[in-house]
């Protein structure tokens, strides 16, 4: 004969566990039904009656099958530097992530607790390591033959243009200025592996590093100490 299908609540066989979407109620000593996501246990089961479930109230949720007496409260509304990427519903918590131009300086289980603006590299410095959702931009001085004339969290150092005749040599924060004849083309820095420029190499002045006012995030970076913030602005 086929085994009887037990309906909740039921007493489990000794040494066995309750089935999927059931839990063992210590008081009743019975296997009882869990409540589905979006619900909670309004009345716990007894030896003769199963769990009574009820829907979560506004701004509360349960994400899993459960037997909690109260639904969890959704997190607070997203701050102005965040965007809501998942709304608060009866079945899921609100998720806030950082808006473009910001990164997560302090994360939580889902989403972000604290966003910070991405560091901006000042003229003479370029982005050496782009910012990510969870890490800040790293700025580095422009190498000889390259420049950056912007304050930006995305711009890299760009090669100086080649001039047939240089009017003003380029430096770390300014492109070379050619005389009225047009430049041959934008150049990459000449090196062992690169063709040499038409004209004599531009004079290159390294910018003086200045400390950043951006917040330190050394404890947040996944691989070692925080990169230096020199060449960045805090705005």
């Amino acid at each position: 004969l086929p085994a009887q299908v037990a309906f909740t609540p039921y007493a489990p066989e000794p040494g066995s566990t309750c089935r999927l979407r059931e839990y063992y109620d210590q008081t009743a000593q019975m296997c009882c039904s869990k409540c589905s996501p979006g619900q909670h246990a309004k009345v716990f089961c007894t030896k003769t009656s199963d769990t009574v479930c009820d829907s979560c109230e506004d701004s509360t949720y349960t994400q899993l099958w459960n037997w909690v007496p109260e639904c969890l409260s959704c997190g607070s509304r997203c701050s102005s530097d965040q965007v809501e990427t998942q709304a608060c519903t009866r079945e899921q918590n609100r998720i806030c992530t950082c808006r473009p131009g910001w990164y997560c300086a302090l994360s939580k289980q889902e989403g972000c607790r604290l966003c910070a603006p991405l560091r901006k590299c000042r003229p003479g410095f370029g982005v050496a390591r782009p910012g990510t959702e969870t890490s800040d931009v790293v700025c580095k001085p422009c190498a000889p033959g390259t420049f950056s004339n912007t304050t930006s969290s995305t711009d890299i150092c760009r090669p100086h243009q080649i001039c047939n005749v240089v009017a003003i040599p380029g430096n770390a924060s300014m492109d070379a200025v050619c005389t009225s004849t047009s430049p041959t083309r934008s150049m990459a820095p000449g090196a062992v592996h690169l063709p040499q420029p038409v004209s004599t190499r531009s004079q290159h002045t390294q910018p003086t590093p200045e400390p950043s006012t951006a917040p330190s995030t050394s404890f947040l970076l996944p691989m070692g100490p925080s990169p230096p913030a020199e060449g960045s602005t805090g705005d």
Epitope: P141, A143, P144, T154, D155, P159, M223
Partner: antibody, heavy 114, light 108 residues
């Protein structure tokens, strides 16, 4: 004139370690990232990792995490790549490059053979 | 990690022919952080096009680059013998930095 001067070719036995060097002229390594790139014979380019010599911060491709160690000595303006437990798979040309990978060294040929 | 897929792996072109090779990223890459390199046997890679569309030093005007998001390309308007080489695309938008497997361009 910017150049990245790399150490000479190496012939080493399997199981050994080797340390390759890269010394730029024309800029201070504290002002850049130093990257290392691997190229096996007749193969493509593989990024190994990078170091920020200003603070010793390193990042590796997970594939090379247990194989490579990148270090830098700011006093001699030199970056290093140490490779351990060498096998024939490590036979390759190793290049160093600057922050934006604009400047590259001439490459160091490493041959692992018994 | 961002995987860069180059196609074709090998191609051949006649002198004067227009050549286009592509580089497809597994996830979006900022055009600022997408470079192309040219490499010939026995030499180090040479920066050829930086930030998607800017020609490096000494690169002939017949070369051009374009693209955005996940799709990038390098074009030679009229093939010359000296263009025979392997071309690699490279991204450093996200760590780990990655290279495409390369497109080997041969002279037909």
């Amino acid at each position: 004139e910017v150049q990245l001067q790399q150490s000479g070719a190496e012939l080493v036995k399997p199981g050994a370690s080797v340390k390759l060097s890269c010394t730029p002229s024309g800029f201070n390594i504290k002002d850049t990232y130093m990257h290392w790139v691997k190229q096996r014979p007749e193969q493509g380019l593989e990024w190994i990792g990078r170091i920020d010599p200003a603070n010793g911060y390193t990042e590796y491709d997970p594939k090379f995490q247990d194989k490579a160690t990148i270090t830098a000595d700011t006093s001699s303006n030199t970056a290093y790549l140490q490779l351990s437990s060498l096998t024939s798979e490590d036979t390759a040309v190793y290049y160093c490059a600057d922050t934006q990978l604009y400047y590259w060294g001439q490459g160091t040929t490493l041959t692992v053979s018994s | 990690q961002i995987v860069l897929t180059q196609s074709p792996a090998i191609m051949s072109a006649s002198l004067g022919e227009r050549v286009t090779m592509t580089c497809t990223a597994s996830s979006s890459v900022s055009s600022t952080y997408l470079h192309w390199y040219q490499q010939k046997p026995g030499s180090s890679p040479k920066l050829w096009i930086y930030s998607t569309s800017n020609l490096a030093s000494g690169v002939p005007a017949r070369f051009s680059g374009s693209g955005s998001g996940t799709s990038y390309s390098l074009t030679i308007s009229n093939m010359e013998a000296e263009d025979a080489a392997t071309y690699y695309c490279h991204q450093y938008h996200r760590s780990p930095l990655t290279f495409g497997a390369g497109t080997k361009l041969e002279l037909k």
